[in-house]
């Protein structure tokens, strides 16, 4: 059975909800509208998912194929160092802030970008196939 933490490795469950894209063992939602970082996070949480936490360079490269020049919010924030929403540090890529207000992370086809969390951007949610299901 698939159940437990959103951040765990998902089992190969068969399908994703409408308007979600299945890639590997996860479902991804690429928004059409734009929101600030906090509103994007709330959107994902309300759908038993989380703002995109990228596990490694391979996942990042694969996802960038689906992205354009437009930046999308991901689950990355600078709280005394850049960390993913699951608490893990960013250690496979670089991101730098050009001002003190740039404390949220975004991604486009070219890579990661620090931004003010207030900027309205597209966002990406990630979850396991079927709501709130992950491998223990």
């Amino acid at each position: 059975l698939c159940q437990g933490s959103n951040y765990s490795t998902c089992a190969s469950c068969p399908s994703c909800p409408d308007r979600w894209m299945k890639y590997g063992n996860h479902c991804y939602y690429f928004s059409v509208e734009e929101k600030d970082w906090n509103s994007s996070l709330e959107f994902c949480l309300a759908r038993d998912s989380h703002l995109l936490v990228i596990t490694d360079n391979q996942e990042m490269s694969l996802l960038q194929v689906f992205l354009s020049e437009a930046f999308c919010w991901i689950g990355l924030r600078n709280n005394s160092g850049w960390r993913w929403e699951d608490g893990s540090p960013l250690n496979f890529s670089r991101i730098s802030s050009n001002s003190f207000v740039q404390t949220c992370g975004a991604i486009n086809k070219n890579g990661l970008q620090a931004s003010s969390c207030e900027v309205p951007l597209h966002w990406v949610c990630k979850k396991c196939p079927f709501a709130d299901q992950a491998l223990f």
């Epitope: 050009n98 001002s99 003190f100 207000v101 970008q113 620090a114 931004s115 003010s116 207030e118 900027v119």
Partner: antibody
């Protein structure tokens, strides 16, 4: 084309008040931090105030803190600077400026400026 | 507060010359530096951010370099329209401080 047009400058007595406006066009105003920068006659540039996208966060140097208030109306695409307890040293051309995007707080676009003269 | 000091404060040069303006920060600001050009009676014009990245539409004869505390703005071959005052600015944190300016005049 990005356009920033300041207004509201003029002659005011020391201790007086004045409100400057900056009308923005050619970009989505509600996506950008905005700032005021001033230049006293024959002098260099001095940053005066910055406001966040929502208006919830404002920033000032010590020289104007408590006397100047920056605000914005995203529905009207307008930035404001309320200046009170004005002093002779506040005499300057006041420029409205837009950041570079994503909270990159360099001053990428500038208005033409409005002159504020504080004199009795 | 971080202080920005430019040198020289004024400079005379001729069309075609290579010119370098220096900006020094009172402490390490990494690459958080912008450059602006201002002509008399006009608003400043944005030239460079992050110490070396040219703003859109800025001619390639302008270049920026440096990191930490020492930065330079170089104009490789002066054009008549380049005679102006140049300012550096720290853009990471509060207060956003400017250098005092360098006035570039025709020799």
């Amino acid at each position: 084309e990005v356009q920033l047009v300041e207004s509201g400058g003029g002659l005011v007595k020391p201790g007086g008040s004045l409100r400057l406006s900056c009308a923005a066009s050619g970009f989505t105003f509600s996506r950008y931090y905005m700032s005021w920068v001033r230049q006293a006659p024959g002098k260099g540039l001095e940053w005066v105030a910055t406001i966040s996208i929502s208006g919830g966060n404002t920033y000032y140097p010590d020289s104007v803190k408590g006397r100047f208030t920056i605000s914005r109306d995203n529905a009207k695409n307008t930035l404001y600077l309320q200046m009170s307890s004005l002093r002779a040293e506040d005499t300057a051309v006041y420029y409205c400026a837009r950041e570079g995007g994503y909270g990159n707080l360099w001053f990428a676009y500038w208005g033409q400026g409005t002159l504020v003269t504080v004199s009795s | 507060d971080i202080q920005m000091t430019q040198s020289p404060s004024s400079l005379s040069a001729s069309v075609g010359d290579r010119v370098t303006i220096t900006c020094r920060a009172s402490e390490n600001i990494y690459s958080a530096l912008a450059w602006y050009q201002q002509k008399p009676g006009k608003a400043p014009k944005f030239l460079i951010h992050q110490a070396k990245t040219l703003a859109e539409g800025v001619p390639s004869r302008f270049s920026g370099s440096g990191s930490g505390t020492d930065f330079t703005l170089t104009i490789s071959s002066l054009q008549p329209e380049d005679f102006a005052t140049y300012y550096c600015q720290y853009h990471y944190g509060i207060p956003f401080t400017f250098g005092q300016g360098t006035k570039l005049e025709i020799k």
